[in-house]
Structure formats: C-alpha cells, structure tokens
C-alpha cells in the first residue's frame, strides 16, 4: 500500500528492559525514518500481551490517555510535535507488570508499525552469611548459612571451600510478593581441623554488576586435644632444670590445666605452672610418667609422657633443656 520504491520506517526498541520492583522504568520506543522518507504519525499505542485494550494511547488531537493514569506517562510525546518518540514511563513497578508489551505507531502512508518489548521486573536481594556454630557430631551438619533475601528472580548461591562438604539450598517466598528468599547451608562432618577455617558464599544475581562474595569463619566446638612437648629423650643427671609444656587445642579455650603422674601427685622435683611443668635437677635417675589433664567447657582430655633422667652426661650434653 505505501508508494512503490520507498524505504521503510523502522520502530526501534530494546527486546528486553529491566526494571526494579517499586521503582519506575522507561520502555524506550522510537520511530526511525530513513533520510528521504516522509511519514506522518497520528497515534502511539501501548498494549500488553494477553490483556484487552490498550494501556496508553497518544492521539494527534486528543493527546495522552492511560488505563492507569497515575502509573503511566509518555516521556516525550507532546501535542503539536512530531510523534516520533513513543517511550513510556511506568511508575511503582509491580511483579505483575512483568510481561510482553507492544509499542505501535499509526503512520501515513506506511501504515501501522510495531515492536515488542519484554519488561523484566527485578528485585535486588540482600545477602548475609553467618557461621553455624557446631560441636563434634560425627555426622554431616550445617556449619555456615548464606541467605539471599527478597530477590527476583531468585539469586544463585554457590560455595567455595577447601574443606570438602556439600551445599543444601532451598527457596521460600520473600516478604514482598513475587520475590524469593534463597537459603543455602554448607554441610560437612565437623572436626577440630575445620575450626577457624573459612568458606566463601558466592551470590549471583541479574541486578549485581559482579557476584557478591561473603566469607564465613567456621566455628567447631570440641574438647581439648592434648599433647606434651619439651622432652627429647636425652635428659641426664646434674643438668639444669627443664620444662614440659602441655599443648592443648580446644574451642572454647581451656579453663584449667592439671599435672599429675601415674603414681599420683607430682614428685617434689616437679612444679606445675599452669600449662607448664618445671623439672628441677635431680641427683638420681628417675623414670616417671607425667599426666597433663586439660579442661574446657566441653570436657577434659589428658596426655601422658614418660620422662627418664639417666646417669652420666653425654660427651656433648644435650640433656635437660636449659631455661
């Protein structure tokens, strides 16, 4: 129907436009007219797929009309101007606004020209990560929790860890209708080696320029793991005093150290000083097994060490450790 040999006019618009829940968004739509082409626009129409009627119309003489006047506005179209820009602003975006929209120009002599635009309604989630403090259960339990609240679409959560383990992720409706809260747990069998180590929760979402990384320092509560150090099997008579140290790893921290021997209380040459045991010089050989008992809130554990003080110094004394 247009005159033969004319270049065609084109409606330009993005195929998809993102907008945030509660915010406003502009659906851009322009009529591109080739240099030598002439066109006359008399109406601009916006309609939504699946809905009856048009939601916004700009008429050459009647001006703008809207199905929801408080939520819609032609950005640039004005009476008495060339109607080449049909861009429409939508206010107070709702979840139900997501969908396909048609922008249409009624032109002469080319006729009607339209384009479809997909409006995506997004909601930026809030992300938190927290430790799940655990004890030695002997079975897999959550040790960290990562929550992405109120995202649309749902956020994608992954974990990065050198400790082994596996994720358990679930979704629930967010506070605002149409939004989703994603909760992801990092699950492993707790051990003392895990305590104090970190895992990282990575949250990805369309609304983020880059993924958000949240690091969690793990907490595993465990009773003391005890060992005694300071003895090198080369202690001899008539040498300086030496020290044994009760090395304890625990969470929470140890609340008490108790030294004893397999025979009962400490002999006179052994003096307890908290985590350390002072061994004074002796004048006759000894063969004593010392016990260090360490207590924390979860219980008590002990370690034993047999110390021998032998006769005759070596050619190069390396015996009882000097203070």
């Amino acid at each position: 129907w247009p005159p033969p040999g004319t270049g065609d006019i084109i409606v330009q618009a993005p195929t998809q436009v993102p907008g945030f829940l509660g915010d406003s968004v502009t659906l851009p739509c322009y009529l591109q007219v080739p240099g030598m082409e002439e066109t006359h626009v008399s109406q601009l129409t916006w309609s939504r797929h699946g809905e009856s009627g048009s939601m916004a119309v700009f008429h050459q003489t009647q001006g703008p009309n809207y199905s929801e006047p408080k939520r819609l506005e032609f950005v640039a179209a004005r009476l008495g101007t060339e109607l080449r820009d049909a861009s429409l602003r939508m206010f107070g975006l709702r979840v139900e606004d997501e969908g396909n929209y048609t922008c249409l120009f009624v032109t002469f002599p080319q006729g009607s020209r339209s384009v479809d635009i997909w409006l995506r309604v997004l909601a930026k989630p809030q992300n938190t990560a927290e430790v799940q403090k655990v004890q030695l259960t002997g079975k897999p339990v959550p040790v960290a929790r990562c929550v992405s609240t109120g995202g649309r679409p749902p956020a994608h959560i992954t974990w990065h860890s050198d400790l082994g383990g596996m994720p358990n992720t679930s979704q629930a409706p967010g506070f605002l209708s149409g939004t989703v809260t994603v909760t992801s747990l990092w699950i492993l069998v707790p051990s003392s080696q895990v305590d104090g180590k970190s895992v990282t929760c990575k949250v990805e979402h369309e609304s983020f320029e880059k993924p958000q990384l949240l690091t969690v320092n793990l907490t595993v509560y465990y009773p003391p793991e005890v060992s005694i150090s300071g003895y090198d099997n080369n202690w001899y008579l008539s040498q300086n005093e030496a020290t044994l140290t009760c090395d304890a790893r625990s969470n929470p921290e140890p609340t008490g150290y108790n030294w004893s021997t397999t025979m009962g209380p400490l002999p006179p040459f052994a003096v307890a000083q908290g985590a350390q045991l002072l061994i004074r010089p002796v004048d006759k050989p000894i063969n004593t097994t010392f016990i260090c008992n360490v207590t924390n809130a979860l219980g008590a554990r002990q370690a034993e060490l047999t110390v021998q003080v032998k006769e005759g110094p070596p050619s190069e004394p390396s015996g009882m450790s000097s203070n």
């Epitope: 309609s47 009627g53 008429h59 002469f108 006729g111």
Partner: antibody, heavy 116, light 107 residues
C-alpha cells in the same frame, strides 16, 4: 473551529471523470492527512485513499485500480479527489475526512450520481 | 483485506436500555479500531478511538472495549438522540475497512 466544506453534487455519465473539492479551515492544513471515504445510498462506508498535504504522499485502496487521484492545494488548504472511468456503481456520497488514525472531522458529503 | 463484521445489523431498544453492538475483525487488529455514529442526512461522527478511548465531548454513556479481533460499543443508558447508525473501522492495515453498520432505532 475545524471545518471541511465540500463542493456540490455532481451528475456524471458513465466513463466520465469527477473532481470533488474539500476546503478546510480552523486548523493547520499541512499537519493532518486528508482522506476520502464514500458511502453508496443506504450502504456502508468505503475508504478510497488519503494524502498528506506537506509532501503529497498518498495511499490508495487498490480496489480503485488507478482510477483515483488525490491532490492538494496548500495555498488554499483544499484537498481534491478525482475519480475517472465512472460507472453506475460509483454513485455514492463522497466524504473528505481528516485523519488522526481514525477520522475525527468529516465534510458534509458530496453526492456523485453516475447515470446515462 | 480485513473484514469487519458488525452485529446486529439493526436493532430497536427503549430509552434507558443498555445497548451493545459488536464488531469482529477477520484478523488481529490490536486496538486500532474506531467507532462512529451517523445520524440520518449527516456525515459520521467519531465516538471512540483506539478501541476504548472516548473523544472529548462524547457522552460517557458511550464506551468501547476489546482488542485483537473482538470489539464492543456499549451505550449504558440509551437516549432518544442516540437514534443513528453505528460503524466500526479498523486502521491496523491498508485498506482501512468499516463494518457494514448497525441501525439503532428507538422503541
């Protein structure tokens, strides 16, 4: 006030041509497309074609197979519709109508009678 | 060409009645539909554009609805001065086409 005033009735013989005028006032002539629509007595409306006065672009209903020519005279804000090779079935009231996607203002109509 | 089929072709109703005229397009015309009122001996007068928007000055008892292929003109409370013929028209694609008309009489 927008007004479209058409020329008077015409009686034509088959094979002849007729040229109907439509003088406009009350608006800027070059800002609106002008179309022509006809209505045989007691029948429905039929779109003939239209023109944009600014550059003279036209669009015609193919049914009229080159028999119709729409023109304008910008100096007098007048639109014209000429229909040639008239036949009896062309007898109708011919309207000019200002186009805004729909037709918002119409002339009073011109009766063209084709009869031998 | 797109056919616009109007129904009924004629009807009579009483003052105060609710009157509905329908128009069916032979293919999708979006919302590019106008409705006109033509009183005897006069040219048509535009009532509705873009399927559902009233021209300024048109009484609010006239309303239009629909999109795609099915359209309706409703007169919520018929008045004596509404005696006329009513036409729908599509302007989605050339050639622009009209319905055959609905003649409305007052009982």
């Amino acid at each position: 006030e927008v007004q479209l005033v058409q020329s008077g009735s015409e009686l034509k013989k088959p094979g002849a041509s007729v040229k109907v005028s439509c003088k406009t006032s009350g608006y800027t002539f070059t800002e609106y497309t002008m179309h022509w629509v006809r209505q045989p007595h007691g029948k429905g409306l039929e779109w003939i074609g239209g023109i944009h006065p600014n550059q003279g672009e036209t669009s015609y209903n193919q049914r009229f197979k080159g028999r119709v020519t729409i023109t304008v005279d910008k100096s007098t804000s007048t639109a014209y519709m000429e229909l040639s090779s008239l036949r009896s079935e062309d007898t109708a009231v011919y309207y000019c109508a200002r186009w805004t996607g729909d037709f918002d203002y119409w002339g009073q109509g011109t009766l063209v009678t084709v009869s031998s | 060409d797109i056919q616009m089929t109007q129904s009924p072709s004629a009807m009579s109703a009483s003052v105060g009645d609710r009157v509905t005229i329908t128009c069916k397009a032979s293919q999708n015309v979006g919302t590019n539909v106008a409705w006109y009122q033509q009183k005897p001996g006069q040219p048509p007068k535009a009532l509705i554009y873009s399927a559902s928007y009233r021209y300024s000055g048109v009484p609010d008892r006239f309303s239009g609805s629909g999109s795609g292929t099915d359209f309706t003109l409703t007169i919520s409370s018929l008045q004596a001065e509404d005696l006329a013929e009513y036409f729908c028209q599509q302007y989605q694609s050339y050639p622009y086409t009209f319905g055959q008309g609905t003649k409305l009489e007052i009982k």
